[in-house]
């Protein structure tokens, strides 16, 4: 009922709580003297389902049979309509449509830790749409029983608040959950278990790691566990890895030796526990311990390359370059590189420690046979030295690789190809492909890159430190014992027409011809490898097509003679530059009038 209804009643048969699909009879009846004042047959009773009129009847009462009500609550309101007045509410009633509870499924109980309390979970099944009460019952040895009720609508968990103890670990306990609502009740299948079945140990804590004598090969993991733990699972991985290494141990008593850790690596360690070989469940994983393993002396050898530069008749500059060891080879923080330079015949040697750089430059005499050895050192020791005899890398013309080409291969890659040297190709022990940004003036500070290629390869894809729209000087060396031959080419990964033309800075007259000098185009405006320069000229104030002279690009060249100008004629001159993608815009214009005699 809505409330104490003064004007009449609404009754529902068989019940105001019905099973989905059932039929109900609703009766609305007026109390005495509550109808329309003048003539009771004018009483019009109207039944509403919420706000929708579903039936009406003239008289003191109305009967309605209702079917097909949805799950949930439906409100019926009875109203009285009299002539010349608004409808007035008489009374109302709710009908609750639901289902009996399904049998609770998958009842399982757990006690978290030896000191924890027993808690059970289950699956309720489909919604009943009615208030459903759950009662959990636990019976144990000696007729002991515990019971707990749940008042929550969506109840699927209850904690008994009792602690099972290990005094009799094989004693049986039985749990059962019963669901009850206005339409029926249902009980789960009983779940029978022992202490060992349901106690889930707390995760291990206080995890520590010790490295004896600061060595990665003598590593012990320590932890603390609850008293009854029999089994442990350990998992560990490098911090940057997704894959775990897993170890199962029995009766570990809170310690285990790990034998396969890599040096100078941060690891993550976790441990889980179990009380019995085949009963019960594993604990949650412990909190992670993160620890770095100690360093070991480096393994592997440095990849070393060098460059020679003539200074004068008696001296040469040697620039050494080397690549960092990989993390797995360095096995620690590289503190310095040791470079030893030795004159082989005289036995003189000098050693230098280099920190913070992977290159070293020195000046040595042009005479004598020189060798270098480079090694990397961490706190535990040094790598094996890489030894190189300093030779003239391009001296052996017959060892020069042939038909070297450089082609763009996708974004920021250049494919370098070559043919073996004419001299017996089987003599080649390895090829080295070297590349550096092309800088007019041959700046020795430009970083050098190289890669080594097996003697049977005739191509290499270079991608390290390759930028779009930059021209690279690429050399391919063929090495054989203490001899070397080389060939070079220019290449770029991506190109377009240069952004500007060369700037003519001077025009001078020499014996009836002129010499044009220009400034190089800034590297960032070249937009790739330059192929040609063009010099254009035409008579001032003439509309004729300009004449032009095309000069193949050479790095060091920045002047060129022209001898086809007429004396005492004023010419306008300008220059452009070309890449494989096209021609630049004009550089600056200069006027010049040749003073010499006519030819």
């Amino acid at each position: 009922k809505i409330d104490a209804c003064k004007r009449g009643d609404v009754t529902v048969k068989p019940s105001h709580v019905i099973l989905l699909g059932s039929t109900v009879n609703i009766t609305c009846s007026l109390k005495p003297r509550q109808g329309c004042f003048h003539y009771s047959r004018r009483n019009k009773l109207i039944l509403y389902k919420f706000d929708r009129r579903i039936n009406f009847h003239h008289g003191h009462s109305l009967n309605s049979q209702v079917t097909g009500l949805p799950l949930g609550t439906t409100l019926f309101v009875c109203k009285l309509a009299c002539i010349n007045s608004d409808e007035i509410q008489i009374c109302g009633a709710e009908i609750f449509v639901g289902v009996a509870p399904e049998q609770p499924q998958n009842l399982s109980c757990i006690q978290k830790g030896e000191q924890g309390t027993v808690a059970c979970t289950w699956e309720r099944g489909r919604d009943t749409h009615l208030y459903t009460e759950y009662t959990l019952q636990l019976s144990g040895p000696k007729n002991l029983t515990w019971q707990k009720q749940c008042k929550d609508i969506y109840c699927d968990y209850l904690d008994f608040g009792i602690n099972l103890t290990p005094e009799s670990p094989e004693s049986n306990f039985t749990a059962k959950v019963t669901a009850v609502n206005s339409l029926g009740s249902s009980s789960s299948l009983p779940s029978t278990f022992t202490f060992l079945d349901i106690v889930r140990p707390l995760p291990p804590w206080d995890i520590r790691i010790k490295f004896q004598k600061a060595s990665v090969s003598r590593c012990t993991l320590y932890w603390r566990d609850e008293g009854l733990v029999l089994l442990n699972r350990l998992r560990y991985r490098p911090s940057n890895s997704r894959l775990w290494n897993m170890v199962n141990v029995t009766k570990a008593k809170g310690r285990h030796d790990l034998l396969d850790l890599k040096p100078f690596t941060e690891y993550e360690f976790q441990i889980s526990s179990k009380l019995h070989l085949y009963k019960g469940s594993w604990s949650d994983w412990s909190e992670s311990l993160r620890a770095q393993t100690p360093e070991e002396e480096p393994t592997g050898m440095l990849d070393v390359w060098y460059m020679k530069r003539h200074i004068d008749y008696s001296r040469q500059q040697i620039s050494l370059f080397w690549k960092n060891l990989s993390v797995s080879e360095a096995r620690g923080k590289i503190l310095h590189y040791q470079v030893t330079l030795q004159e082989l015949t005289g036995g003189k040697a000098m050693t230098q420690n280099i920190t913070g750089h992977t290159s070293w430059t020195t000046v040595i005499p042009r005479t004598g046979n020189w060798a270098v050895a480079v090694s990397a050192a961490n706190s535990k020791g040094s790598s094996l030295p890489t030894r190189i005899n300093i030779m003239n890398l391009c001296e052996a013309g017959l060892l020069a690789p042939r038909q070297v080409s450089a082609n763009s291969e996708g974004m920021d890659n250049i494919l370098v190809t070559w043919q073996p040297p004419r001299k017996d190709p089987s003599a080649v022990q390895e090829y080295v492909v070297e590349w550096r940004e092309l800088h007019p003036g041959g700046d020795t500070q430009v970083p050098l890159n190289w890669l080594r290629s097996r003697p049977y390869n005739v191509s290499a894809l270079i991608s390290e430190n390759i930028k779009s729209y930059i021209c690279y000087e690429i050399r391919v060396y063929a090495l054989s014992g203490d001899q070397g031959g080389c060939s070079s080419i220019l290449g770029n990964s991506k190109h377009k027409a240069p952004l500007s033309g060369p700037h003519i800075n001077a025009i001078t007259e020499e014996k009836g011809s002129i010499l044009i000098s220009w400034n190089s185009i800034p590297v960032q405006e070249q937009m790739g490898c330059l192929l040609h320069y063009r010099i254009y000229w035409k008579e001032r104030d003439s509309n004729s097509q300009p004449q032009l002279c095309e000069i193949p690009y050479r790095v060091s060249q920045n002047s060129h003679p022209i001898n086809s100008l007429q004396p005492r004629v004023t010419y306008v001159l300008w220059m452009t530059a070309l890449t494989a993608a096209g021609e630049s815009s004009h550089g600056n214009e200069r006027e010049f009038c040749l003073q010499g005699k006519a030819n």
């Epitope: 609550t73 709710e94 609508i153 969506y154």
Partner: nanobody
Framework: QVQLQESGGGLVQPGGSLRLSCTAS????????MDWYRQAPGNQREWVAS???????YYDDSAKGRFTISRDNAKMTVYLQMNSLKPEDTAVYYC?????????WGQGTQVTVSS
Amino acid sequence: QVQLQESGGGLVQPGGSLRLSCTASGSIFSIYNMDWYRQAPGNQREWVASITPSGDPYYDDSAKGRFTISRDNAKMTVYLQMNSLKPEDTAVYYCKVPTEKGNYWGQGTQVTVSS
């Protein structure tokens, strides 16, 4: 045990607006309808509006077009937005949760529409 607390009533001029709130405690809120009723002096309590758990609203003819019922299940609160109020809307407004075990009513909040 479910408890309901209404708020938001007051004195308002004809044509004005008010927003009533009703907050429930207890978990049954989420499976039952929530209703607003009103009781004018000397009259019996009358149904005004209902909203189902999924948010479907229903209104008595007297409220249609002027009142809006809504609910926030997370906050366990039902609202009644009343616009274009008339003097005949003067009453104590109650919220109610009907359950098969019985009805839960709030204490009511007074709404007076007068110039």
